[in-house]
Amino acid sequence: SGTTNTVAAYNLTWKSTNFKTILEWEPKPVNQVYTVQISTKSGDWKSKCFYTTDTECDLTDEIVKDVKQTYLARVFSYPAGNVESTGSAGEPLYENSPEFTPYLETNLGQPTIQSFEQVGTKVNVTVEDERTLVRRNNTFLSLRDVFGKDLIYTLYYWKSSSSGKKTAKTNTNEFLIDVDKGENYCFSVQAVIPSRTVNRKSTDSPVECMGQEKGEFREI
């Protein structure tokens, strides 16, 4: 139902990485505009992206208030230039999104190797602790602050001269691994939340190799 010149939004999809969260939908509007509302299961609806011709709405500011809550959004369709007009039932057309729980579902962004340092036959590899848009006491929290020990990093490391990748894991942002003296190694890291069933892993970090500028070598 609804007025003849509006269509309901469809394919509502959450796109979220490191809690930066955007709701996307279709279709591209023709003679209509959209408004988005978001709410927790028990909360009130809050309107965002008023009368927009976009087919996406950044809801980060709302979901970061409590990333462990489950959110629902809905997209209202209005005739362009006549936003007071409603559907035949007296309400504007709208479509509900799937439920979204940021803590369980946000994609893990690609990690970055911040540095590595060799001391004798040990190498310390440090992963950058990425800042998120989640705030506590007016400061932005890092990924580690938000996930704590739920977040694991897997390090893949290999001799530059071979293909086999050894692995190491940490629930901090640092690895200390044994290496063969006189060999150059390459490194890549992956963020993992093992307790999840979906979106468990990030993409791999860019590969960093010894003998390049990120590293430091100290002979003991």
């Epitope: 694991i152 894991k169 629930n171 890549s188 468990r200 892993k201």
Partner: antibody, heavy 120, light 107 residues
């Protein structure tokens, strides 16, 4: 329900080849690491190698390096073990196992195994 | 590679007995040790992970502990279904390695 099912085992002559499959259901292999483990008759388990299907990274035991290759087809949710230049000492039951990539990564699910016999 | 030395290789016990199996790692493996139970013709089954954590669905008579590089699997009161072979495994470094196994037989 999480399940791993191996297939492709059988009798092969020394120097021959065989490809084992590990079909996964109840989870997506690209979200985990898949290991191959073998067990010779009357012996303990021996780790063969792993693959991370999300990036194709692999590592092999010295005893099989250069002869065995692990691969994965994420569209089929299946991992493979290609075994070439087989020797009598490769005779074993071959298992695939799932690694949840936790901090200490035990193998939480195993297949039922498939027997490979290398004999002339 | 890290060696996992398991002892004893076999033991005989009666239902209700307390059974202890040990594994010694050749170098530090932190708590990255698991214990598996295997019955003839079957795949190993995870019992204990991270040295002392009971895997889901495993009876509470099974427990694990760590002291440095020594790891212990204890069955507090042996049940008929516990007669099997037990293996330890480290996954601290690549390659993961297994102990040689302990066969628990009926006395």
């Amino acid at each position: 329900e999480v399940q791993l099912v191996e297939s492709g085992g059988g009798l092969v002559q020394p120097g021959g080849s065989l490809r084992l499959s590990c079909a996964a259901s109840g989870f997506t292999i690209s979200s985990y690491i898949i290991h191959w483990v073998r067990q010779a008759p009357g012996k303990g388990p021996e780790w063969v190698g792993y693959i991370d299907p999300s990036n194709g990274y692999t590592y092999y035991a010295d005893s099989v390096k250069g002869r065995f290759t692990i691969s994965a087809d994420t569209s089929k949710n299946t991992a493979y073990l290609q075994m070439n230049s087989l020797r009598a000492e490769d005779t074993a039951v071959y298992y695939c196992a799932r690694d949840p990539q936790t901090l200490t990564s035990p193998f939480d699910y195993w297949g039922q195994g498939t027997l490979v016999t290398v004999s002339s | 590679d890290i060696q996992m030395t398991q002892s004893p290789s076999s033991l005989s016990a009666s239902v209700g007995d307390r059974v202890t199996i040990t594994c010694r790692a050749s170098q530090d493996v932190n708590t990255a040790v698991a214990w598996y139970q295997q019955k003839p013709g079957k795949a190993p089954k995870l019992l204990i992970y991270s040295a002392s954590f009971l895997y889901s669905g495993v009876p509470s008579r099974f427990s694990g502990s760590r002291s440095g590089t020594d790891f212990t699997l204890t069955i507090s009161s042996l049940q008929p279904e516990d007669f099997a072979t037990y293996y330890c495994q480290q996954h601290y470094t690549t390659p993961p390695t297994f102990g040689q196994g302990t066969k628990v037989e009926i006395k």
